[in-house]
Amino acid sequence: AWELTILHTNDVHSRLEQTSEDSSKCVNASRCMGGVARLFTKVQQIRRAEPNVLLLDAGDQYQGTIWFTVYKGAEVAHFMNALRYDAMALGNHEFDNGVEGLIEPLLKEAKFPILSANIKAKGPLASQISGLYLPYKVLPVGDEVVGIVGYTSKETPFLSNPGTNLVFEDEITALQPEVDKLKTLNVNKIIALGHSGFEMDKLIAQKVRGVDVVVGGHSNTFLYTGNPPSKEVPAGKYPFIVTSDDGRKVPVVQAYAFGKYLGYLKIEFDERGNVISSHGNPILLNSSIPEDPSIKADINKWRIKLDNYSTQELGKTIVYLDGSSQSCRFRECNMGNLICDAMINNNLRHTDEMFWNHVSMCILNGGGIRSPIDERNNGTITWENLAAVLPFGGTFDLVQLKGSTLKKAFEHSVHRYGQSTGEFLQVGGIHVVYDLSRKPGDRVVKLDVLCTKCRVPSYDPLKMDEVYKVILPNFLANGGDGFQMIKDELLRHDSGDQDINVVSTYISKMKVIYPAVEGRIKFSTGSH
């Protein structure tokens, strides 16, 4: 028998520095977690103690904090190189700055192979990107070799900016021939490493003949055997065992997100490459694990540029940006409109001639808007200003919801109106009318939504049975502020870009902004 230790991360999302327990900015260092300096300590400790170790990343290193905004992926390559990752799969967020924003900072600088079998380049890009990412890699480990095949969510064109010269194929269809090639090469230990979410990970384990282990990402799935060490609730045991169509037991793993845990899986193979046993658990990277001094020093050196950036002007406002709770928790506020417009703008993807865009709607809990921005400071808007408006380090995500769920969400928005509660929704691509004289749960009297399958966008009544795409904060997608119906009834959820980054990019693009209150949210006569 031959034993392999797989160490894995996924959806790190730019958390290079240690974070608080909820993966936001570290405040009390003695209680902080994660970060590459701490990760390195643990990885090195395992490498010294065990003979056959692979360190793998399942994608979405890009996007999530000011680190990515400033360094644009150079930080990912630098610190992943320093940690000596063995391989990485491409995630959807690796395309957030377009293909060039992937090629130059990461693909050309990474010292480890970057993988995806289901992304095929065409046209002029094919020769430019050739060899910079690969469908599979054969990694020598000890006296054996391990095959790694990569995959990436085929929804990436709707979630990011890969351009028109990359084709995202069905994962299973693309993986099988590459696994077959590895088998032909007499590589009999094969890991599928990728970024399509836990449901697809399980399907790959079931359907792709020859895959021995699946290491996934995208869905931020937390798996754990025994008593979990922090706040995350396990979606299943670690590893999650799938019985393949040809009768094999295939371990599937994921390690939550944000570098909070290091996935740790031990696999025992027989001489023919069959999995005999698999066991492990994610390791919580808490403050009991010291940060490596040399990596930490490097982090501090790179940090300097971030502090300078946060005070630079992004753009100007010529109007007061009303982000006060007195406005945003009671009525349409222009800060809410600005943020929603930025959210939609960030999701412009012309992937189908029938649609002017794949999504037109935004909802945003008023309680998530934490500060106004005064225009009487020469109109200047800085990252620092936006960090006061959006201090929670969230993301603006894409969900699919039925019209009936949206109607429930808007009823929830005003079910206890007048108490300055955070659930009052700010909107984009939606016209809503409330009648507060009616009883809670029946106060939405008009709900019109902007069409997407149209050449001239216009507002049509919401259809209860239709499925709509909506951009919203991850806080709402996870049921925050009492929006349990969204969490329970959503049909799809893809995590998006860092909230501040979305708004800052929009302001930089627009240069000068003047959002108005324009009648997106109305109250019927006599009730307000």
């Epitope: 010292k111 192979p113 020598p140 007499n186």
Partner: antibody
Framework: QVQLQQSGPELVKPGASVRISCKTS????????IYWVKQRPGQGLEWIGW????????KYNEKFKGKATLTADTSSSTAYMQLSSLTSEDSAVYFC????????????WGQGTLVTVSA | DIVMTQSHRFLSTSVGDRVSITCKAS??????VAWYQQKPGQSPKLLIY???TRHTGVPDRFTGSGSGTDFTLTISNVQSEDLADYFC?????????FGGGTKLEIK
């Protein structure tokens, strides 16, 4: 573009050792295997072994174990092959090469280094 | 070791002709076969890998076929610059082995 530049010809005495270098450019050295191939004058090709500069693991053709030692220096993106206890049978042109996809054919070759073993 | 046999040490052809170079493996290697062209005093050049995939920049008159034990490199519309040695190679099992080569001569 991908390039592999080998060191110049060597004339060595029987029993001695020689080290051939293969300096690479145009790609990330640590991400691809380097293969070594022997060609005797007017003869076919023989695969000697490979090194993976990402972790310095090596694999040898049994026939060349003890004869060839493969190493790599990531700081200079250079691979080396040391040949020891040389005999006239070791007189040959030695090539380094790189693939496009692991193992699947040698796509890029050095220009070759002629080693002549003669008293 | 797997022996790769190229039965013709020499093949003679004319410009514009179609010629097939064959290679037989002593045991099955699926499609783990590459073909190389080598001109005098030069390094080998990869033409085909995975038995039938043409390497970037290789003219489409070069075609590879076969699987298991029998493999063929076909050159249609032979050009004078195709005068060279052609080698097959298997990379299915260690040690990886090459055929003895076939020298293509132009009449």
């Amino acid at each position: 573009q991908v390039q592999l530049q080998q060191s110049g010809p060597e004339l060595v005495k029987p029993g001695a050792s020689v080290r051939i270098s293969c300096k690479t450019s145009g790609y990330t050295f640590t991400r691809y295997y380097i293969y070594w191939v022997k060609q005797r004058p007017g003869q076919g090709l023989e695969w000697i072994g490979w090194i993976y500069p990402g972790n310095f693991n090596t694999k040898y053709n049994e026939k060349f174990k003890g004869k060839a030692t493969l190493t790599a220096d990531t700081s200079s993106s250079t691979a080396y092959m040391q040949l020891s206890s040389l005999t006239s049978e070791d007189s040959a042109v030695y090539f380094c090469a790189r693939d496009v996809y692991d193992y699947a054919g040698f796509a890029y070759w050095g220009q070759g280094t002629l080693v002549t073993v003669s008293a | 070791d797997i022996v790769m046999t190229q039965s013709h040490r020499f093949l003679s052809t004319s410009v514009g002709d179609r010629v097939s170079i064959t290679c037989k493996a002593s045991q099955g290697v699926a499609t783990a076969v590459a073909w190389y062209q080598q001109k005098p005093g030069q390094s080998p050049k990869l033409l085909i890998y995975w038995a039938s995939t043409r390497h970037t920049g290789v003219p489409d008159r070069f075609t590879g076929s076969g699987s298991g034990t029998d493999f063929t490199l076909t050159i249609s519309n032979v050009q004078s610059e195709d005068l060279a040695d052609y080698f097959c190679q298997q990379y299915s099992s260690y040690p990886w082995t090459f055929g003895g080569g076939t020298k293509l001569e132009i009449k």
